[in-house]
Interface confidence: low
């Protein structure tokens, strides 16, 4: 058991031309988080793979408000170390993602902000409890400087953590075939206790408990030899009776996954999804808590203080699982609408519409009206992908070049006469009506109805429609 | 096809509260920002405030003291209070859609609302 | 508040033209810039967002360019209902800030 860590020293522009654009601004100030992923062995796998060496999350930096006109400068960074507890033996080979994700801090609309600005990815050899080694990563136009170790928890020691030391019994000297601890000279190394009854001769362990044979045997205590000699079945349950060389069992046979995990085959290996409290190569480490940091992917880890109590990761958009370890494909849902191009950022969704169109998910036709003027002052207004023109008072048609008869709808009622007026048209009203279309009888008494005449104006007298 | 149609009083004495409402029709309301932009008459246009979905707002502050922007989602609606006014407020004000995060972009605006504050 | 310089305050030109407006930030405001284009009587109408992002449905002949404190607006080809007066916006900061207006006229 042991401890990787990580000390990210800087994050900037790289060196050249094409500073980067400072992810925040005076308007959305944000902040720095860093995750790291670590998986063993020297293997490309996809960066949505499970952490199987673990993960750690940084606590969030400094708020940073760009300096208006100034190059993105190095941004602030949180403080301390990020550390990523590996409780089976140190690889001594290893994969590495590390992400840098920006947080805005204004007022967020449709969940938290946080986006990765950089991700950077490599694969190293690193012994146990050496010295810091240094590293350059550049992602597009920016540069993340670090540094790293893997240490050994005591009682481990060695370059993979593998070897136990004890208090020495006597000052002097280590047990029968033991030597002293280097560099703790003052303790001996322990005994590795195998599983009980594995072969002292054709099996071995790295940890307690276990029994790995040796080429050539095989068996749960390595007691059984290989043959190779022809058999019957290529998968049959003979084959660790009679010693046959056989492609042997399905990496998932037996379901080498612990607590409940699921096991499923990869062209080389084994894959365990485990159940939440549970991670590792083979769901073997428990008493997870969200200091271990087992939300991936810019998750967010709630409760678990102690390992008692559960964690829950609450994923950001576009991941799932109990560890946020599944991407979402969100796109598969075909939310961008009138052919937009669809585009999974991880933080958020986003369409890009074709032209003519806009919207968050391309909903709106703006292309009705694109290039077609209405005449005379009329407004072009669009809908079912045909444009129609609402024309000012005295034109008509199509596109508002037609100039209209007002009157021609006969708009004065009650028998009011119709006069085109240049602002429009104009109503001289039948004895007994009166308002701008006649609409309105008189009462005898000569009181109106509805509404009261404007002063000066008798009933009768031409009323103008504005 | 959004629409941004506006509405309030148009004629305001001195010290007077100015009261006007937006409605939006068509499109979503939640994921931007709307504002309030004011043009004295032969003059240039200057930004009010704005307000998102959920209340949050920002205001100009040569006008804060002064002025309230509200939200009342269950209408698509958003409004603007400006108190103690005087004739440096006569302008045609105008409410308007601001996209988040995708650079200056008020796309959609309302008609315009003159409000004229004379004794 | 960041100010907003546009110029020139007016010009005259004839249709077929290429015109170039500028406005200028008192401080480095990244891209985030639009243009607006306002007619009489009407509500302003966006152009360009980002400095350089045509807005959809606008004619290619607007053009949006420049970065951090000097931005221009061209029209490659100035048309007859191009006469209006346009107006740069920065929502780099708060306040939004509008610059002064360039009217460009018939010559």
């Known amino acids: 058991a042991g401890v990787f860590e990580l000390q990210i020293h800087s994050f900037g522009p790289g060196p050249g031309p094409g500073a980067p654009r400072s992810p925040c601004s005076a308007r959305l100030p944000c902040r720095l988080f860093f995750r790291v992923c670590l998986k063993p062995g020297l293997s490309e796998e996809a960066a949505e793979s499970p952490c199987a060496l673990g993960a750690a999350l940084s606590a969030r930096g400094p708020v940073y408000t760009e300096q208006p006109g100034a190059p993105a400068p190095d941004l602030p960074l949180p403080d301390g170390l990020l550390q990523v507890p590996f409780r089976d033996a140190w690889p001594g080979t290893f994969s590495f993602i590390i992400e840098t994700w920006r947080e805005e801090l204004g007022d967020q609309i449709g969940g938290p902000a946080w986006s990765l600005l950089a991700r950077v990815a490599g694969r190293r050899r690193l012994a146990a409890g050496g010295p810091w080694a240094r590293d350059i990563q550049r992602a597009g136009a920016w540069e993340l400087r670090f540094s790293y170790r893997a240490r050994c928890e005591p009682p481990a020691v060695g370059t993979a953590c593998t070897r136990l030391c004890r208090p020495r019994s006597a000052p002097s000297r280590c047990g029968p075939g033991l030597r002293p601890c280097a560099p703790l000279e003052d303790e001996c190394e322990a005994p590795l206790v195998c599983r009980a009854g594995c072969s002292p001769e054709h099996g071995f362990c790295e940890q307690p408990g276990e029994c790995r044979c040796l080429e050539g045997w095989t068996g749960p205590l390595c007691t059984v030899p290989v043959s190779t000699s022809s058999c019957l079945s290529p998968r049959g349950p003979s084959s660790a009776t009679t010693g046959c060389l056989v492609p042997g069992p399905g990496p998932c046979d037996g379901n080498p996954c612990a607590n409940g995990g699921s096991c499923s085959e990869t062209p080389r290996s084994f894959e365990c999804t485990c159940p939440r409290g549970f991670y590792g190569l083979r769901c073997e480490v428990s008493g997870v808590t969200c200091a271990d940091g087992p939300c991936f992917n810019g998750g967010l880890c709630v409760g678990g203080a102690d390992p008692d109590s559960a964690y829950i990761c609450h994923c950001p958009p576009g991941f799932q699982g109990s560890n946020c370890e599944k991407r979402v494909d969100r796109c598969s849902l075909q939310p961008c609408r009138n052919g937009g191009l669809c585009l999974d950022l991880g933080h958020a969704l986003r369409c890009r519409c074709r032209a003519g169109f806009a919207g968050p998910r391309c909903e709106h036709d703006l292309d009705d009206c694109a290039g077609r003027a209405c005449a005379n002052g009329g407004t072009c207004v669009e809908g079912g992908g045909a444009h129609r023109c609402s024309c000012a008072l005295g034109f008509g048609g199509r596109d508002c070049r037609e100039r209209a008869d007002p009157c021609a709808a006969r708009p004065c009622a009650h028998g009011g006469r119709c006069y085109a007026h240049f602002s429009g048209l104009v109503c001289a009203c039948a004895p007994g009506y009166m308002g701008a279309r006649c609409e309105f009888p008189v009462h005898p008494d000569g009181a109106s109805a509805l509404p009261a005449a404007p002063p000066g104006l008798r009933p009768g007298d031409p009323q103008r429609y504005l | 096809q959004v629409q941004l149609q506006q509405w309030g009083a148009g004629l305001l004495k001195p010290s007077e509260t100015l009261s006007l409402t937006c409605a939006v029709y068509?499109?979503?309301?939640?994921?931007?920002?709307w504002s309030w932009i004011r043009q004295p008459p032969g003059k240039g246009l200057e930004w009010i405030g704005e307000?998102?979905?959920?209340?949050?707002?920002n205001y100009n502050p040569s006008l804060k003291s002064r002025v309230s922007i509200s939200v009342d989602t269950s209408k698509n609606q958003f409004s603007l209070k400006l108190s103690s006014v005087t004739a440096a407020d006569t302008a045609v004000y105008y409410c308007?859609?601001?996209?988040?995060?995708?650079?200056?972009?008020?796309?959609?605006w309302g008609q315009g609302t003159l409000v004229t504050v004379s004794s | 508040a960041i100010q907003m310089t546009q110029s020139p305050s007016s010009l005259s030109a004839s249709v077929g033209d290429r015109v170039a407006l500028t406005c200028r930030a008192s401080?480095?405001?990244?891209?985030?810039l639009g243009w607006y284009q306002q007619k009489p009587g009407k509500a302003p109408k966006l152009l360009i967002y980002?400095?350089?992002s045509l807005q959809s449905g606008v004619p290619s002949r607007f053009s949006g360019s420049g970065s951090d404190t000097d931005f221009t607006l061209t029209i490659s080809s100035l048309q007859p209902e191009d006469f209006a007066t346009y107006y740069c916006?920065?929502?780099?900061?708060?306040?939004?800030?509008f610059g002064g207006g360039t009217k460009v006229e018939i010559k």
């Open positions: 401080q480095g405001i990244r891209d985030d």
């Open positions: 980002a400095a350089s």
């Open positions: 916006l920065q929502d780099y900061d708060y306040p939004l800030t």
């Open positions: 307000i998102t979905h959920s209340g949050s707002t």
């Open positions: 308007a859609r601001g996209e988040y995060g995708s650079g200056s972009r008020f796309d959609y």
């Open positions: 068509g499109g979503s309301f939640s994921g931007y920002y």
